[in-house]
């Protein structure tokens, strides 16, 4: 039985050219996290964090994705095309798979403030 919940940074906004932290957190379960996958809205994998092998950043994102903090991901040099949904998929044993969603809006405005708060979607 899957008892866990995924908390995410929810809906966030950040400036074009800036950076943003995508963060998910799995709670309320004792399941072992074996792998975390980070994906973009168009089904492209940004990164995988395997419990034994560590981080792998996918080729298309090597120049502007940094692993961490923790199991999160830092997306740098933001463009307007980065606006959209991001998904964290937690592969766990014995529970199975948990999935969280974050919506990122990249703003042209120089007054755009990075807003992020933890919430349960």
């Amino acid at each position: 039985m899957m008892t866990g919940t995924i908390e995410t940074t929810g809906n966030i906004s950040a400036k074009k050219g800036g950076s943003v932290i995508l963060q998910c957190h799995l709670s309320s379960t004792m399941a072992q996290v074996t792998q975390v996958n980070w994906e973009q809205h168009d089904h492209s994998l940004l990164a995988i964090r395997n419990a034994e092998l560590g981080w792998h950043i996918y080729p298309a994102f090597k120049d502007r994705v940094a692993p961490g903090p923790g199991l999160g991901l830092t997306l740098q040099s933001l463009t307007m095309n980065d606006t959209g949904e991001y998904f964290c998929t937690y592969h766990t044993y014995p529970d199975g798979t948990y999935r969280g969603r974050i919506f990122l809006e990249v703003l042209e405005s120089s007054v755009a403030e990075h807003s992020a708060r933890f919430q349960i979607p």
């Epitope: 996958n37 034994e52 092998l53 792998h56 592969h91």
Partner: antibody, heavy 120, light 107 residues
Framework: DVQLQESGPGLVKPSQSLSLTCTVT?????????WNWIRQFPGNKLEWMGY???????RSNPSLKSRISITRDTSKNQFFLQLNSMTAEDTATYYC?????????????WGQGTSVTVSS | DIVMTQSHKFMSTSVGDRVSITCKAS??????VAWYQQKPGQSPKLLIY???YRYTGVPDRFTGSGSGTDFTFTISSVQAEDLAVYYC?????????FGGGTKLEIK
């Protein structure tokens, strides 16, 4: 140049254990790779069996979990497969393979394979 | 486990032809797919990683595409030396699993 070479018995009796060795040359098994065992059954089906990481931690296919052990000897740059309670269904060609973690995240090095038959 | 299905066990083609081999995942695997070539009597060799990236030294006649559950491996102009079995493999989650293979036969 990185090379992997499997060695071990070609014939195993039912209920006995299979022990295979993979010797890696040209690269340290403590650097940046997952070192895998994969087998290919008659008819060509490929099955990933498990790996030992560069740090020494392991992960294996749940279908083999109770029977498989993957270990290593860093001083000899070798890693090992032990598969217990062998049956005729374990007859296959066994490959060791290097899974590159940083750039490709795929099996970019393979040994030449060693054929194992389970028969009395 | 994620099942990778290559619907064609055999494909027959001629030198110079374009051929596409398909692979379908039983569930979403994003772009976590590699393609391998296995020539008779040899071990598999990595051709494509991350669904669409050519491995070092692989000729540009080999391409990969797809995401989600549907993937395609294409040889733009088949050469005689391309006679082999081609396998897809997913690494979206362990256990890593392979397709059943597609044997390319040259007419």
């Amino acid at each position: 140049d990185v090379q992997l070479q499997e060695s071990g018995p070609g014939l195993v009796k039912p209920s006995q254990s299979l022990s295979l060795t993979c010797t890696v040359t040209g690269y340290s098994i403590t650097s940046d790779y997952a070192w895998n065992w994969i087998r290919q059954f008659p008819g060509n089906k490929l099955e990933w069996m498990g790996y030992i990481s560069y740090s020494g931690s392991t992960r294996s296919n749940p279908s083999l979990k109770s029977r498989i052990s993957i270990t290593r000897d860093t001083s000899k740059n070798q890693f090992f497969l032990q598969l217990n309670s062998m049956t005729a269904e374990d007859t296959a060609t066994y490959y060791c393979g290097g899974w590159e973690v940083r750039n490709y995240y795929a099996m970019d090095y393979w040994g030449q394979g060693t054929s194992v038959t389970v028969s009395s | 486990d994620i099942v990778m299905t290559q619907s064609h066990k055999f494909m027959s083609t001629s030198v110079g032809d374009r051929v596409s081999i398909t692979c379908k995942a039983s569930q979403h695997v994003s772009t976590a797919v590699a393609w391998y070539q296995q020539k008779p009597g040899q071990s598999p060799k990595l051709l494509i990683y991350s669904a669409s990236y050519r491995y070092t030294g692989v000729p540009d006649r080999f391409t990969g595409s797809g995401s989600g559950t549907d993937f395609t491996f294409t040889i733009s102009s088949v050469q005689a030396e391309d006679l082999a079995v081609y396998y897809c493999q997913q690494h979206y989650n362990t256990p890593w699993t392979f397709g059943g293979g597609t044997k390319l036969e040259i007419k």
